[in-house]
Amino acid sequence: SWMWNQFFLLEEYTGSDYQYVGKLHSDQDRGDGSLKYILSGDGAGDLFIINENTGDIQATKRLDREEKPVYILRAQAVNRRTGRPVEPESEFIIKIHDINDNEPIFTKDVYTATVPEMADVGTFVVQVTATDADDPTYGNSAKVVYSILQGQPYFSVESETGIIKTALLNMDRENREQYQVVIQAKDMGGQMGGLSGTTTVNITLTDVNDNPPRFPQSTYQFKTPESSPPGTPIGRIKASDADVGENAEIEYSITDGEGHEMFDVITDQETQEGIITVKKLLDFEKKKVYTLKVEASNPHVEPRFLYLGPFKDSATVRIVVDDVDEPPVFSKLAYILQIREDARINTTIGSVAAQDPDAARNPVKYSVDRHTDMDRIFNIDSGNGSIFTSKLLDRETLLWHNITVIATEINNPKQSSRVPLYIKVLDVNDNAPEFAEFYETFVCEKAKADQLIQTLRAVDKDDPYSGHQFSFSLAPEAASSSNFTIQDNKDNTAGILTRKNGYNRHEMSTYLLPVVISDNDYPVQSSTGTVTVRVCACDHHGNMQSCHAEALIHPTGLSTGALVAILLCIVILLVTVVLFAALRRQRKKEPLIISKEDIRDNIVSYNDEGGGEEDTQAFDIGTLRNPEAMEDSKSRRDIVPEALFLPRRTPTARDNTDVRDFINQRLKENDTDPTAPPYDSLATYAYEGTGSVADSLSSLESVTTDGDQDYDYLSDWGPRFKKLADMYGGMDSDKDS
């Protein structure tokens, strides 16, 4: 039996010799060299080698426990002469012993944390974590202890958990806001010789309301004319607060004084200033000076800091009223009026009112400041202040009209007042939705019916408020005859779908689709937009290859070289057919190909009447130029194309120089093809058309099953096709037998 225990090996061995692992030994080993020890498994022959005579195992390379802690190997002892096993194959383990070769690594290089200022000692700030790749089950190589290198006496760290806490009472943000703390993580339980890593923790003190507002001065003085209407700002006062954010927000109030009911104070949220405003109409003749007590306070107070004193401060405000010879006073500081954009000329929008505040009560007249209404869109009744339109409006051109109205004392024209008028033009649905962009799209010739080729979007100049509701449809004149349909997606978009299988760019290269877009607003508005759809040749993945109509219907599009090549091709074909027919007549009439599946020889025998109209009509130079574009199922060319809406033909491309090369290539292929009879080469050069029900005669038997085609119609084709009719008319009965 085998005689060994588990083997252990220290990682990261740096000696010059191979590291000795242990010895495999069988009690069958007599020491005469008759036994051979074999090692297999993890790293055998590479990391671990064995002396096949003695069974001594050595490690050839430095091993890293963190990479692989255990190696599982198999030992064999075989008779050196016979190769037969002396001992059963046995599995053994080499365990790699850990050394402290990895330092703790923090999960982050830099931590950021916040803690409120004035926090109690021991308040949690953040927890840092370091991991050590060494073996946590053996020794202290992976036992991490945390300590603070920088940041005392403000913060401390729990050695076991890495939790950072505040260590100093009453840390004040207003004094210092940012702290940089350096934490060390050391293995070996923090003992000497341990490996360490550090991380930086940026700690920010967040604000608490620990500072009250304070006025920089105890007394303020302002002047205001007696004519100041209610709401007029008289002056600004400002208390300062060392806190930030909502803790620095200040509310101002008038707490005392003789002018309590005459004035108001409001807080400017932007600047945190107190604005003293007039609350009631002042009268110099009645009272010339007012003294107020104004208080500034924090609305957000933290009860635990109330011991720091009241979170408010007071100041005295003295207001002196000035005597004025007052101009007319408008009933409002500004007027906001509204009018619909479809308002007729002379429609009254609203009115303004002003009066002389003096005891004389002089009458007033009104006018529009023409500098603010250069286009003279508005007018005012000079007597009663009614504002009316003098021109038609358009909200889509201008939504707001800001004009100024002047009120002047008739008896004293120097005394005048101005007031702003903000006139909002209300939307009327007077604009039709229209396409969001110009749509030119493409359809592949091989496209299937109901295929989405373009998504349409619309825009409307009218006020969308919270959204438009558009619908899309084909214009009535195109709806019945169109080769495409519109699918309204009911989400303000629509799709253009193909209506049929396959398009022929030689018949129609471009379609213009008139699409009607309407809103469901009131009154409904609509417009007709045109979508251009171009028919293109595409590859099997639907990628466009060519969008030019290249067909014989445009002979002008062919170069002289191309025409010569076509004529040459036709001559060669005719000569080939004639020669072949002549040779056949001289030969003994035996079938060229015995198989019933290939009946081309019969076709040649009886196809002596020449090409018919359909054949010549079907010949398409476009196919020669782009053989990949040939469709599996060609559309008939002897049928008048259905009516198309607004067809637009594009001129045929003139670059037919590659036709000659293509024909020569096909000629060469067929000339060197031993299996292709010459008469069949016609099919290689041009598509023969599908005008007749039978497709091309050269493919009568090319269908997938014999039962796919019915040739009874051949008998209707007259005496010339009698032989064919006889041959194929009764094929079904042959097959049954």
Epitope: R340, L426, D427, V428, N429, D463, Y465, S466, G467, H468, Q469, S471, S473, A475, P476, A479, V516, S518, D519, N520, D521, Y522, P523, V524, S526
Partner: antibody, heavy 116, light 107 residues
Framework: QVQLLESGGGLVQPGGSLRLSCAAS????????MSWVRQAPGKGLEWVSV????????YYADSVKGRFTISRDNSKNTLYLQMNSLRAEDTAVYYC?????????WGQGTLVTVSS | DIQMTQSPSSLSASVGDRVTITCRAS??????LNWYQQKPGKAPKLLIY???TLQSGVPSRFSGSGSGTDFTLTISSLQPEDFATYYC?????????FGQGTKVEIK
């Protein structure tokens, strides 16, 4: 799903007033023009009034102009029809409907009877 | 105001029949015509808008055609649930007006 629920109908004397409400749910009410359509007993449909999505523009059939007022509160998703100076010929089922041209969703209707 | 005239006023048909209802406008309304279905005691339901666009959720046996002054609603194969009154409505110009209705009854 889209729901429109009218309320406020009932019996009223000629010359009286009534306010109809239509509570909308299941769609963004503020995006759509809204309409009122009525149907006198045994008769066909008659368009009454429409209000645009923002409420900025309102329109009325000649038969109700000056007597009826359409309004909306987009924050409450509610459409209103204030009917004053009611006449016997205003007796009908009043439907609120979504849309300003084609009415793709309708409420179940509320009956207004004007009779002495 | 634009007058909308529907014909016939009523018709009797059997399940599976092809039914055609026409609507004529007193002046051209382009394609701004809707078709509604109304069953007794119920609110109308939009079938077709813009003359030929099928409202979502409406069976494909309903179709609309026409433009200008003459419009047609066709039910290709009448189903039991299709017996109702059908109204056309123009929204070409204010005030929007409805046809007087066509009642489709069981034969």
């Amino acid at each position: 799903q889209v729901q429109l629920l009218e309320s406020g109908g009932g019996l009223v004397q000629p010359g009286g007033s009534l306010r109809l409400s239509c509570a909308a749910s299941g769609f963004t009410f503020s995006s759509y023009a809204m309409s009122w359509v009525r149907q006198a007993p045994g008769k066909g449909l008659e368009w009454v009034s429409v209000i645009r999505s923002s409420g900025s523009s309102t329109y009325y059939a000649d038969s109700v102009k000056g007597r009826f007022t359409i309004s909306r509160d987009n924050s409450k998703n509610t459409l209103y029809l204030q009917m004053n100076s009611l006449r016997a010929e205003d007796t009908a089922v009043y439907y609120c409907a979504r849309g300003g041209g084609y009415f793709d969703y309708w409420g179940q209707g509320t009956l207004v009877t004007v009779s002495s | 105001d634009i007058q909308m005239t529907q014909s016939p006023s009523s018709l009797s048909a059997s399940v599976g029949d092809r039914v055609t209802i026409t609507c004529r406008a007193s002046q051209s309304i382009s394609l701004w015509l809707n078709w509604y279905q109304q069953k007794p005691g119920k609110a109308p339901k939009l079938l077709i808008y813009a003359a030929s666009t099928l409202q979502s959720g409406v069976p494909s046996r309903f179709s609309g055609s026409g433009s200008g002054t003459d419009f047609t609603l066709t039910i290709s194969s009448l189903q039991p649930e299709d017996f109702a009154t059908y109204y056309c409505q123009q929204y070409y110009t204010s005030p929007y007006t409805f046809g007087q209705g066509t009642k489709v009854e069981i034969k």
